[in-house]
């Protein structure tokens, strides 16, 4: 039975700035080389038939739900893309993370402008701070890493704050063993 395809993002952020580029790729095995791909954006069929969907110079209208489908195989799980216009944007490798999986956060400046004195906050408390921009890279996420995150920083000598982002770390499902 062919597996459901999976949509991946490159760069891996599902929150991007207006004007940035992102490539969505429909990954899956057991697909013929010649097979075309269907892309759905907010439920509407896209004209793109390649396994990659390039969003260039992102607009607000590019926000929303994306799904892909190979041949007559089931549709992929949805991926949600959000396009922002702001000074700072907190980006995460995933907003729902399985316990034990990595979690990566970055405080991204509009137009890639330098952001300095960056502070990450979790549930309202300063978590990590440095004189320049920096990231948070958690190798093995735990349930304690769940929370509401945001970042602050200076751009062109002025202080800014990102929109908050909820991160949820869920427990990995226990393997079930059946007696034969």
């Amino acid at each position: 039975v062919p597996q459901k395809p999976k949509v991946s993002l490159n760069p891996p952020w599902n929150r991007i700035f207006k004007g940035e580029n992102v490539t969505l790729t429909c990954n899956g095995n057991n697909f013929f080389e010649v097979s075309s791909t269907k892309w759905f954006h907010n439920g509407s069929l896209s004209e793109e038939t390649n396994s990659s969907l390039n969003i260039v110079n992102a607009k607000f209208e590019d926000s929303g739900e994306y799904k892909c489908q190979h041949q007559q195989v089931n549709e992929s799980e949805p991926v949600y893309l959000e396009v922002f216009s702001d000074w700072l944007l907190l980006q995460a490798s995933a907003e729902v993370v399985m316990e034990g999986q990595p979690l990566f956060l970055r405080c991204h400046g509009w137009r890639n402008w330098d952001v300095y004195k960056v502070i990450y906050y979790k549930d309202g408390e300063a978590l990590k701070y440095w004189y320049e921009n920096h990231n948070i890279s958690i190798t093995n996420a735990t349930v304690e890493d769940s929370g509401t995150y945001y970042c602050t920083g200076k751009v062109w000598q002025l202080d800014y704050e990102s929109e908050p982002l909820n991160i949820t770390v869920i427990k990995a499902p226990r393997e079930k063993y059946w007696l034969q």
Partner: antibody, heavy 121, light 111 residues
Framework: EVQLVQSGAEVKKPGESLKISCEGS????????IAWVRQKPGKGLEWMGI????????KYGPSFGGQVTISADKSINTAYLEWSSLKASDTAMYYC??????????????WGLGTLVTVSS | QSVLTQPSSVSGAPGQRVTISCTGS?????????VHWYQHLPGTAPKLLIY???IRPSGVPDRFSGSKSDTSASLAITALQAEDEADYYC???????????FGGGTKLTVL
């Protein structure tokens, strides 16, 4: 009460390896950077580098990258400074210090008492 | 050669006022990075004295004060006391070196 307790003085020969430690207590260890600062005999303070135990992010001072290794074990609230091959010029007092964010300023608010390392043949 | 330049020594009689300068550049103090001051007595751990230019942690007497202008900062000590005899270091951050930087230290002698 916040405390940084450093390991004891060491006397080593050139070429030997060494790992000194700094144990933090009285605060949430993983959520504060721990820095290492060197003071050679009769000289001033030099920033060697820093580690954030929460995610093991590490940064080194310009003269120290590749010369030493900074690590931490957040399960036992301890940071380490390690040499693979000591030189006589590594003879110094080594301090660990906590880097805190207070009223918008990033500062070394608590210091250990230092570990004296003597390297001599 | 330190990135932040301090006088190697200053001295004053008890009750007098002394200042210690800390001269940097446009990539550290002049770039707007905070300047902090530490007091270091031989055989003890360095102690935070002034942070964020002129904020005193609790327990530090108001005889100690800090100031900043352009690419330099100063520590002033009034009503000098014998127990103030120590080494004093300024500290900031340098964006070109991407490094925390200390001054070379100033030895204060109370005459």
């Amino acid at each position: 009460e916040v405390q940084l307790v450093q390991s004891g003085a060491e006397v080593k020969k050139p070429g030997e390896s060494l790992k000194i430690s700094c144990e933090g207590s009285g605060y949430r260890f993983s959520s504060y950077w721990i820095a290492w600062v060197r003071q050679k005999p009769g000289k001033g303070l030099e920033w060697m580098g820093i580690i954030y135990p929460y995610d093991s992010d590490t940064k080194y001072g310009p003269s120290f990258g590749g010369q030493v290794t900074i690590s931490a074990d957040k399960s036992i609230n301890t940071a380490y400074l390690e040499w693979s091959s000591l030189k006589a010029s590594d003879t110094a007092m080594y301090y660990c210090a906590r880097l805190a964010l207070i009223r918008g300023s990033i500062i070394f608010d608590y210091w250990g008492l230092g570990t004296l390392v003597t390297v001599s043949s | 050669q330190s990135v932040l330049t301090q006088p190697s020594s200053v001295s004053g009689a008890p009750g007098q006022r002394v200042t210690i300068s800390c001269t940097g550049s446009s990539s550290n103090i002049g770039a707007g990075y905070d300047v902090h001051w530490y007091q270091h007595l031989p055989g003890t751990a360095p102690k935070l004295l002034i942070y964020g230019i002129n904020i005193r942690p609790s327990g530090v007497p108001d005889r100690f004060s800090g100031s900043k202008s352009d690419t330099s900062a100063s520590l002033a000590i009034t009503a000098l006391q014998a127990e103030d005899e120590a080494d004093y270091y300024c500290q900031s951050y340098d964006s070109s070196l991407r490094s925390v930087v200390f001054g070379g230290g100033t030895k204060l002698t109370v005459l």
